[in-house]
């Protein structure tokens, strides 16, 4: 019985898209066949969910439709990316781990990745 | 105001039911997994039970299991606690508890207190 | 099943003074402890979590510290409010367990 560590990258630049990419890495204590994993976001010590989804081992990684997450899992990893985003969605975004099933329950926090996103200039207007 | 308010305690029997419940307000309660925790007179606190938000997966102490069922109604933002066989070492304040994102019981009821005596 | 150890179970302090309460596990829980403070007859309230991260609203008098096995909750200056039962808890795995408690109470 030990506690589960994960590891996710310091920091992450948006593409100009508004789209972001990082992998979630986690140490499993337990043979899980069940997991949990949720985006964070942390911003004046407030934390919002931004989206989350349960996989079972060996399987794809689903977020509901309407999520602004998708990811794909492979062993201890999920890699995932968030769309959408704005200039003033930049902030720290924390991996959050659950082995749900079977139990025991372990839970799993990463330090957070700060994902800078910076808005497009508009395309400047032309003569021709 | 994020609240939560216990009811159902009282006086019961060895061996006698007794159902609580917790009732959720100020919150969206169906995001977030609920624990009940108890605590004996003068003593420590002790967790029971907790439930995921959607109902999925539920954790028992050793000391319950078997004995308590915990359940949830999203719809109508309460968690209860069914007690069965009831033992005269259940006698306790039990809180319901809201787990927080990262983890810890972050919101608690003001507790209700159950008496398993003959 | 980890077992949390509070040490000692009473500590007496004058309004004012610094008081540091220890918190050791039998086996690592990373950074997954939290600490309440508990009055007679009231509810326990969530001061710190993930070892050192004060909750919404606390003051910033109280602070943790620690990570593995080993850990710590100062208080730096006791208000008089602040006379209370103190628990330490982990939530890094089920069953979740809390320590016995150390009551702060007035010299």
């Known amino acids: 019985c030990k506690a589960m560590h994960v590891a996710q990258p310091a920091v992450v630049l948006a593409s100009s898209r508004g789209i972001a990419s990082f992998v979630c890495e986690y140490a499993s204590p337990g043979k899980a066949t069940e997991v949990r994993v949720t985006v964070l976001r942390q911003a004046d010590s407030q934390v919002t969910e931004v989206c989350a989804a349960t996989y079972m081992m060996g399987n794809e990684l689903t977020f509901l439709d309407d999520s602004i997450c998708t990811g794909t899992s492979s062993g201890n990893q999920v890699n995932l990316t968030i769309q959408g985003l704005r200039a003033m969605d930049t902030g720290l975004y924390i991996c959050k781990v659950e082995l749900m099933y079977p139990p025991p329950y372990y839970l799993g926090i990463g330090n957070g990745t700060q994902i800078y996103v910076i808005d497009p200039e508009p395309c400047p207007d032309s003569d021709f | 105001e994020v609240q939560l308010l216990e009811s159902g305690g009282g006086l019961v029997q060895p061996g006698g039911s007794l159902r609580l419940s917790c009732a959720a307000s100020?919150?969206?309660?169906?995001?977030?997994?609920m624990s009940w925790v108890r605590q004996a007179p003068g003593k420590g606190l002790v967790w029971v039970s907790s439930i995921s938000s959607s109902s999925s997966y539920i954790y028992y102490a050793d000391s319950v299991k078997g004995r308590f069922t915990i359940s949830r109604d999203n719809a109508k933002n309460s968690l209860y606690l069914q007690m069965n066989s009831l033992r005269a070492e259940d006698t306790a304040v039990y809180y319901c508890?809201?787990?927080?994102?990262?983890?810890?019981?972050?919101?608690w009821g003001q507790g209700t207190m159950v008496t398993v005596s003959s | 099943e980890i077992v949390l150890t509070q040490s000692p179970a009473t500590l007496s302090f004058s309004p004012g003074e610094r008081a540091t309460l220890s918190c050791r596990a039998s086996?690592?829980?990373?950074?997954?402890l939290a600490w309440y403070q508990q009055k007679p007859g009231q509810a326990p309230r969530l001061l710190i979590y993930?070892?050192?991260s004060r909750a919404t609203g606390i003051p910033d008098r109280f602070s943790g510290s620690g990570s593995g096995t080993d850990f710590t909750f100062t208080i730096s200056r006791l208000e008089p409010e602040d006379f209370a039962v103190y628990y330490c808890?982990?939530?890094?795995?089920?069953?979740?367990?809390f320590g016995p408690g150390t009551k702060v109470d007035i010299k």
């Open positions: 808890q982990q939530y890094g795995s089920s069953p979740f367990t």
């Open positions: 086996q690592s829980v990373s950074s997954y």
């Open positions: 100020g919150f969206t309660f169906s995001s977030y997994a």
């Open positions: 993930g070892a050192s």
């Open positions: 508890a809201r787990v927080g994102l990262m983890g810890p019981f972050d919101i």
